[in-house]
């Protein structure tokens, strides 16, 4: 908290400009004006102030703004976001995506910060959906975001949305996770071509149920073996030897080398043994 | 609902076989989605995992104790058996049957019983 | 093999606090990794089962994350109940391994 004093003559800021830096904190107190501070804080990214003095910048802009700042104050604070709580983001109502990637241009190279969780939040909230233009942004920064979600708030997300995932998005997610996004990429990519439909769905299918992959298998899509190994265990077991067989195409070879991982083990372990001994790569069941 | 019980004798002589058994109660030991297994814990040390049977007679070993495992499965008994050949004193420990659920993992455990070798 | 690293190796802590245990995998096991309570005298017992589901009857207090190599077991809010030691286990890998352990004690 820096002490009310009054501001030296010919110190009162008319603009913000560079020669600010050479203010002290309670000068900058003193003698810059909160509302000038709110009108030209798209000058303040520019100014290498201290993170001393970025605190009486901040504290400045929280006087004038108790209950939370304006988005147009908001699109210009830049590195000031760095100083910001999460309680901070709360009090906002952040609307703009212009907004939204201007700030997390400010924490780009970053490991998501409490803040910016908190800013995605309040974003999402407040269009009450994530959109395939918001996911696209948020993917583009954060490529695990939306493995982030829980399976509750993967709900919101639109089918329309699915559109936006690139495979590395949802390489953290869990089998809880692609189980609430598979029916929504199936809805989105329903109207595609066999091998278009089965190149936009395999990242999503560590959620698909067992009727699905029988169905895949009668479409010569050749499915590779790390794709096999992110299957729900449970839509795996029921699959005969032979569907197994098309499903995977000349991967199939590839079940050989994981015979001892899951979910191959426990399919192999449910399989008769005459069937296993047709595919001619010494499984024991 | 699905119970364990282990049962054999609680000491064996060093360069013997140690034999327990387990029996299921509650549900049954050919059940599609379980296989069963046998867990050890030394006195104040950690699990070690021992093996695993399927109904259907297969079986999976702990590499490191392959050699002198055998686990078996008896469908008309609802049990399976744990044989440990040649064992030691590093062989004392609580020995668990578990079933192993899968889609969870060790889900329902016996209460143990206490092997202890020594001549 | 695939060896599971737990850590700490013990913790002392307090009624309330939130406690964090880590287990790490010698190689990737995807989200195939469980968490198990033992009580002194007694079995293990369940807790999370595919990395971070919730196995029934357990408090939701209790809860996993984490894939491939690294995983966690939080404990939001230590009751009394929950001093015990707690092991990691991976089912993906035939050799089914247990972490060493992780006691939690009274501070």
């Known amino acids: 908290e820096v002490e009310k004093t009054a501001c030296p003559s010919g110190k009162k800021a008319r603009e913000i400009d560079e020669s600010l830096i050479f203010y002290k904190k309670w000068e900058l107190e003193a003698c810059v004006d909160a509302a000038l501070l709110a009108t030209q804080m798209d000058r303040v990214n520019a100014i290498p102030f201290t993170y001393e003095q970025l605190d009486v910048l901040k504290h400045k802009l929280d006087e004038l703004y108790p209950q939370g700042y304006p988005e147009s104050v908001i699109q210009h604070l830049g590195y000031l976001f760095l100083k910001m709580s999460p309680e901070d983001i709360r009090k906002w109502n952040v609307t703009s995506l212009e907004t939204l990637k201007a700030l997390l241009e400010v924490n780009k190279g970053h490991e998501m910060s409490p803040q910016v969780a908190t800013l995605i939040d309040r974003f999402v909230k407040g269009r009450g959906q994530l959109d395939k233009d918001t996911l696209d942004t948020l993917t583009a920064f954060y490529p695990g975001y939306l493995c982030s979600l829980s399976p509750e708030e993967l709900s919101s997300v639109p089918p329309s949305s699915i559109w936006a995932v690139r495979p590395q998005d949802l390489d953290t997610c869990d089998p809880r996770q692609l189980d609430v996004l598979y029916p929504k990429a199936r809805l989105a990519f329903q109207n595609m071509n066999g091998s278009e439909y089965f190149v936009k769905i395999q990242s999503f299918l560590g959620g698909a149920p067992t009727e699905d992959l029988k169905a895949l298998s009668q479409q010569n899509v050749s499915m590779d073996l790390a794709t096999f190994m992110k299957l729900r265990t449970d839509a795996v077991l029921p699959l005969t030897v032979a569907e197994v067989q098309k499903l995977l195409g000349p991967h199939v070879e590839g079940l050989k080398a994981e015979e001892r991982h899951r979910p191959v083990r426990d399919w192999i372990l449910r399989q008769r043994q005459d069937d296993l001994d047709t595919l001619g790569l010494g499984l024991q069941g | 609902q699905v119970q364990l019980q282990e049962s054999g004798p609680g000491l064996v002589k060093p360069s013997e076989t140690l034999s327990l058994t387990c029996t299921v109660s509650g549900g049954s030991v050919s059940s599609y989605y379980s296989t069963w297994s046998w867990i050890r814990q030394p006195p104040g040390k950690g699990l070690e995992w021992i093996g695993y049977i399927y109904y259907s007679g297969s079986t999976n070993y702990n590499p490191s104790l392959k050699s002198r495992v055998t686990i078996s499965v008896d469908t008309s008994k609802n049990q399976f058996s744990l044989k440990l050949s040649s064992v030691t004193a590093a062989d004392t420990a609580v020995y668990y049957c578990a079933r192993d659920n899968v889609f969870t993992g060790f889900d329902i455990w016996g209460q143990g019983t206490m092997v202890t070798v020594s001549s | 093999d695939i060896q599971m690293t737990q850590s700490p190796s013990s913790l002392s802590a307090s009624v309330g606090d939130r406690v964090t245990i880590t287990c790490r995998a010698s190689q990737s096991i995807s989200s195939y990794l469980n968490w198990y309570q033992q009580k002194p005298g007694k079995a293990p017992k369940l807790l999370i089962y595919?990395?971070?589901s919730l196995q029934s009857g357990v408090p939701s207090r209790f809860s996993g994350s984490g894939s491939g190599t690294d995983f966690t077991l939080t404990i939001s809010s230590l009751q009394p109940e929950d001093f015990a030691t707690y092991y990691c286990?991976?089912?993906?890998?035939?050799?089914?391994?247990f972490g060493g352990g992780t006691k939690v004690e009274i501070k």
């Open positions: 595919a990395a971070s």
């Open positions: 286990q991976q089912p993906y890998d035939a050799s089914y391994t």
